[in-house]
C-alpha cells in the first residue's frame, strides 16, 4: 500500500490521543534504555510503511502484535485516514484469522514495540526544511 495520500495530521492526532497510551501500557515495566532503536524511517509515508510492517507482520519470536489494542487502533486509524487502505487489508485479515495464536508477550515483542515507538515519534515530528 502507498501511504502517500494519507491524512498524516489526523493519524498523528489518533496516535497522540490513544495509540501512544496503549503502547505505554504494553511496555509497562520495561526500561526505556533496555532496547536500542535500530529501525528508522525517512519521511511520513515511509514511517507508516515501517509501522504497518512491524505492527501487523509476524516476525521470528513475535507473532502476536496484530491482536493488541494499539494494533487494532492503528489499523482503524489507517483505515479511516488512508484512502483505499481497508480494501488492501481484507485478504491479509482473512489470512490472519486462520492462524490465530495465543497472545504471548515475549522479549522480542517488547523490543519490536520499542522500535514502533521510535517510528511513531519520527512520524509525528519530521524535521521540516526551512525555505
Amino acid at each position: 500500500y502507498d501511504f502517500t495520500n494519507c491524512d498524516f495530521e489526523k493519524i498523528k492526532a489518533a496516535y497522540l490521543s490513544t495509540i501512544s497510551k496503549d503502547l505505554i501500557t504494553y511496555m509497562s515495566g520495561t526500561k526505556s534504555t533496555e532496547f536500542n532503536n535500530t529501525v528508522s524511517c525517512s519521511n511520513r509515508p515511509h514511517c507508516l510503511t515501517e509501522i504497518q510492517s512491524l505492527t501487523f507482520n509476524p516476525t521470528a519470536g513475535c507473532a502476536s502484535l496484530a491482536k493488541e489494542m494499539f494494533a487494532m487502533k492503528t489499523k482503524a486509524a489507517l483505515a479511516i485516514w488512508c484512502p483505499g487502505y481497508s480494501e488492501t487489508q481484507i485478504n491479509a485479515t482473512q489470512a490472519m484469522k486462520k492462524r490465530r495464536k495465543r497472545k504471548v508477550t515475549t522479549n522480542k515483542c517488547l523490543e519490536q514495540v520499542s522500535q514502533l515507538q521510535g517510528l511513531w515519534r519520527r512520524f509525528n515530528r519530521p524535521l521540516l526544511k526551512q525555505q
Epitope: D7, E9, K10, K12, A13, Y15, L16, S17, S20, S32, T33, F35, N36, N37, S40, S42, Q117, G118, L119, W120, R121, R122, F123, N124, R125, L127, L128, Q130
Partner: antibody, heavy 120, light 111 residues
C-alpha cells in the same frame, strides 16, 4: 534517566567559530529530534535548529541558516552545534534539548547550558 | 513565522493568590483537534523546565496548582495558589509550524 551533558564555557573573538557538544546518556539517542536553543543575557529563548540523528537530517531557523551547522555522532550519542562568523550579539547561553517520547514537540530533557562569550 | 506574544511582561502576585499568564499566537497552532502549545518555567541559572504540554496536559512531576487552557490562538497558564518557589520566568512555545517559536517570556514575582 536520560541526561544531556554539554561542553564547557567558551570565550571567542569576533569573526571566529565555536563548536558546542551535547552528550546524551541513559537512553536511546538516534530516534529523538535534538534541538539547540540559545538565550542572550537577560533575554528570551531562541530556537536555532534541530537534527534527527537517525539519518542526520537537519532543520534550521532561517536567522542562523548561513552560520549554524548541527551534526550528530550516533556512535558516541553526541550532538554538535557550530556557529561561525561570531559577533558580540552571539554572546549567550546555548542549550541542547531533546524532544519528548511521543513527538508532541516539547522539550523534556535539557542540557545544563554552555556560555559562549564573544569579545575582542 | 508564528509570533507568540505573552502578557503581561511581568506580574507580581501575593503568596497564595492566583497568577494568570496569557499567550497569543499570530495564527492558530491547532491541528486535527489538538493544540500544539507548550509552557515552560525557567529559574535563574537553570535551563527551562516543561510545565504544560499540548495546551492543558501537566508535565511529569509538575504540581497540580499549575494548569493550562486555550485553543487556536489564545492560551492561558494559571497558577491557582502562588508559592515562593514559583518565582521564575514563564515561556510559551508553539510547535505546530516550523520554525519553532517561543513567547518573549513573563517574569513572575511575589507582591
Amino acid at each position: 534517566e536520560v541526561q544531556l551533558v554539554q561542553s564547557g564555557a567558551e570565550v571567542k573573538k569576533p569573526g571566529s567559530s565555536v563548536k558546542v557538544s551535547c552528550k546524551a546518556s541513559g537512553g536511546t539517542f538516534s530516534t529523538y529530534n535534538m534541538h539547540w536553543v540559545r538565550q542572550a543575557p537577560g533575554q528570551g529563548l531562541e530556537w536555532m535548529g534541530a537534527i534527527y540523528p537517525g539519518n542526520g537530517e537537519t532543520s534550521y531557523n532561517q536567522k542562523f541558516k548561513d552560520r549554524v551547522t548541527i551534526t550528530a555522532d550516533k556512535s558516541t550519542s553526541t550532538a554538535y552545534m557550530e556557529l561561525s562568523s561570531l559577533r558580540s550579539e552571539d554572546t549567550a547561553v546555548y542549550y541542547c534539548a531533546r524532544e519528548d517520547d511521543y513527538g508532541e514537540g516539547y522539550f523534556d530533557v535539557w542540557g545544563q547550558g554552555t556560555t559562549v562569550t564573544v569579545s575582542s | 513565522d508564528i509570533v507568540l506574544t505573552q502578557s503581561p511582561d511581568s506580574l507580581a502576585v501575593s503568596l497564595g493568590e492566583r497568577a494568570t499568564i496569557n499567550c497569543r499566537a499570530s495564527e492558530s497552532v491547532d491541528n486535527s483537534g489538538l493544540s500544539f502549545m507548550h509552557w515552560y518555567q525557567q529559574k535563574p541559572g537553570q535551563p527551562p523546565k516543561l510545565l504544560i504540554y499540548r495546551a492543558s496536559n501537566l508535565g511529569s512531576g509538575v504540581p497540580d496548582r499549575f494548569s493550562g487552557s486555550g485553543s487556536g490562538t489564545d492560551f492561558t497558564l494559571t497558577i491557582s495558589s502562588l508559592q515562593a518557589e514559583d518565582v521564575a520566568v514563564y515561556y510559551c512555545q508553539q510547535i505546530n509550524t516550523d520554525p519553532l517559536t517561543f513567547g518573549q517570556g513573563t517574569k513572575l514575582e511575589i507582591k
